[in-house]
Amino acid sequence: MDSFNYTTPDYGHYDDKDTLDLNTPVDKTSNTLRVPD
């Protein structure tokens, strides 16, 4: 199967599935990290 072209920046090209989605709130401890738009 051919790979596909991406519309996101190249920094993600060699990532893995455990890359955090920083566009959503993340609650790993008692503190919640909210990344602004």
Epitope: S3, Y6, G12, H13, D16, K17, D21, D27
Partner: antibody, heavy 119, light 110 residues
Framework: EVQLVESGGGLVKPGGSLRLSCAAS????????MHWVRQAPGKGLEWVGR??????????DYAAHVKGRFTISRDDSKNTLYLQMNSLKTEDTAVYYC??????????WGQGTLVTVSS | QSVLTQPPSVSGAPGQRVTISCSGS????????VSWYQQLPGTAPKVLIY???QRPSGVPDRFSGSKSGTSASLAITGLQAEDEADYYC??????????FGGGTKLTVLG
């Protein structure tokens, strides 16, 4: 052409062992995290485990149901991913796929190889 | 039982719009990206949506993805006969494992 080709599947008795291979071509294999995913006949997709690239640390993680029995390794000089399966159970019967990760998704999949565990 | 919850089946007539939901928790969908895959009978899965809402080149814009909190959804508009397939959502989990939905069988009526 970017391609993954699995091999090594077949019929094995419960308690037996099998080693699957996944040959990569058309891309810089060493730079990518690689995963194994399986699918029992008529069932859904089930994650087996992964190995990160050397640049990412080369670490492995496994699903609970295969931990201690399955081992994932890679030979970047041969552009090949491996899945060593020991102490096989009937419930391990499935089509096994290798998959490449890019942009947080499985963007390239192999065609799959069938493993049948039966006495 | 799958960590991510999808409806077992959905159906729609040609030209209609259908959505497939995928429910998770703060340890997976709430923290990590969601992907959607299409699997036609006897073939390997193919990615339709990556990073929640991004579409690979070659995938028709009839397919769209969204994510809100701990849930995600796949929408298919202008349903076509060739869309009949199994669809899976997918994410990572804090417990260092990948998680899939149980899959949804899409039937195109008529």
């Amino acid at each position: 052409e970017v391609q993954l080709v699995e091999s090594g599947g077949g019929l094995v008795k419960p308690g037996g062992s099998l080693r699957l291979s996944c040959a990569a071509s058309g891309f810089t294999f060493s730079s990518y995290a690689m995963h194994w995913v399986r699918q029992a006949p008529g069932k859904g997709l089930e994650w087996v485990g992964r190995i990160k690239s050397k640049a990412q640390g080369g670490t492995t993680d496994y699903a609970a149901h295969v931990k201690g029995r399955f081992t994932i390794s890679r030979d970047d000089s041969k552009n090949t991913l491996y899945l060593q399966m020991n102490s096989l159970k009937t419930e391990d019967t499935a089509v096994y796929y290798c998959a490449r990760v890019s942009f947080s998704t499985f963007d390239v999949w192999g065609q799959g190889t069938l493993v049948t565990v039966s006495s | 039982q799958s960590v991510l919850t999808q409806p077992p089946s959905v159906s729609g007539a040609p030209g209609q719009r259908v959505t497939i939901s995928c429910s998770g928790s703060s340890s997976n969908i709430g923290s990590y990206y969601v992907s959607w895959y299409q699997q036609l009978p006897g073939t390997a899965p193919k990615v339709l949506i990556y990073r929640n809402n991004q579409r690979p080149s070659g995938v028709p814009d009839r397919f769209s993805g969204s994510k809100s909190g701990t849930s995600a959804s796949l929408a298919i508009t202008g349903l076509q006969a060739e869309d009949e397939a199994d669809y899976y959502c997918d994410s990572w989990d804090h417990s260092s494992m990948n998680v899939f939905g149980g899959g949804t069988k899409l039937t195109v009526l008529g």
